[in-house]
């Protein structure tokens, strides 16, 4: 995992300007872990960042991610109606200028360096789930969530008609 200590320093400067023409309603610096308490870590390999899901050794420092929360201005297609009200969207940035992106063609989650305004692929509908967990649904592909597959993050289609085990799309956020 690479050091994220710089996040705190750049957070304020980065987000004084707006990302999508609107400013985040709030921001949160947190470590991201799975429902089963595996950590989401980020590693620099061959000049690009890889995302891993792994058990950390005792006392090993967790990587932090800057979550920027936005009010959605338009209901998700998934909602099925025009009066669904506002939703919360989120972008996730583990280090300066890099954001998690949904690659819907490859069903993968990638870290991309990009400039503002961020593309829609960097935005996720935030779902408030029980057990102090959240889920992240692709803005660009309703019904598709960030999930865990083979010790990596992947995009997982959640069909409400299927009995999918939900645990692989549940994530915990922690300040420690």
């Amino acid at each position: 995992a690479f050091g994220i200590s710089g996040v705190q320093k750049y957070t304020r400067a980065l987000h004084d300007s707006s990302i999508t023409g609107i400013s985040p309603i709030t921001e949160y610096l947190a470590s991201l872990s799975t429902y089963n308490d595996q950590s989401i870590t980020f590693a620099l390999e061959d000049e690009s960042y890889e995302i891993y899901v792994e058990d950390l050794k005792k006392d090993e420092k967790k990587d932090k991610v800057l979550l920027s929360y936005y009010e959605s201005q338009h209901p998700s297609n998934e909602s099925g109606d025009g009066v669904d009200g506002k939703m919360l969207m989120v972008t996730l940035s583990p280090t300066k200028d890099f954001w998690l992106h949904a690659n819907n063609k490859e069903h993968s989650v990638e870290l991309h360096k990009c400039e503002k305004p961020l593309p829609d692929q960097a935005f996720f509908v935030l779902h408030n789930m029980h057990s102090n967990c959240v889920s992240f649904e692709c803005k660009t592909d309703p019904g598709v969530f960030i999930g865990v597959k083979d010790n990596h993050l992947a995009l997982i289609k959640v069909d409400s008609s299927e009995n999918l085990c939900t645990e692989n799309i549940l994530f915990k956020l922690s300040e420690t």
Partner: antibody, heavy 121, light 111 residues
Framework: EVQLVESGGGLVQPGGSLRLSCAAS????????MNWVRQAPGKGLEWMAE??????????HYAESVKGRFTISRDNSKNTVYLQMNSLRAEDTAVYYC????????????WGQGTLVTVSS | DIVMTQSPDSLAVSLGERATINCRAS??????????LNWYQQKPGQPPKLLIF???SQGSGVPDRFSGSGSGTDFTLTISSLQAEDVAVYYC?????????FGQGTKVEIK
Amino acid sequence: EVQLVESGGGLVQPGGSLRLSCAASGFTFSNYWMNWVRQAPGKGLEWMAEITLKFNNYSTHYAESVKGRFTISRDNSKNTVYLQMNSLRAEDTAVYYCARRNYGNWYINVWGQGTLVTVSS
Amino acid sequence: DIVMTQSPDSLAVSLGERATINCRASESVDKFGMSFLNWYQQKPGQPPKLLIFVASSQGSGVPDRFSGSGSGTDFTLTISSLQAEDVAVYYCQQSKDIPYTFGQGTKVEIK
């Protein structure tokens, strides 16, 4: 038009049972967590019960005051959520609202008009 | 359970004046870096209507005169310029923990 319509309320004796129904229309019912909230005459709001989605294994949650007596369930094929109320007490007298949480589960943003349940001998 | 306490119980305000309602939680309702605190308006004979979610975000179609603030345990709903149609009972609600709990309500009337 998004709508929730409750039915099944009425007068029941203490110790009796009632089953409330809530028919949903105008939205994809299977995508939403559903709740029941009640309001005793002239009193405030009290959250009662919640049911989640199929991929959450339809997990249910209850207020302590009704746990073991009330059961929330849903039938996605009928776009309906139910509240089975057993061992009713005088203090259960209230208007019962069916309510839908918004997409993402942050707040309730669709309410029915309510159905009155009166528990009295 | 998290106990929500509103003050005052009732409030009489002149048309066009500011109305302020307070809500205190018995423990913090913050989680994931935000406050799980909603405000609802209920008019006589009607179901409640969402005004504010996560402490300060306006619900869809809610007039700009309604605003929310606060974090942790102390929250405020402000009506910047009271209109006749704002006569109602206002409830705060925490959605951080089950059971979701409401405040006892604040009745707002015209002075």
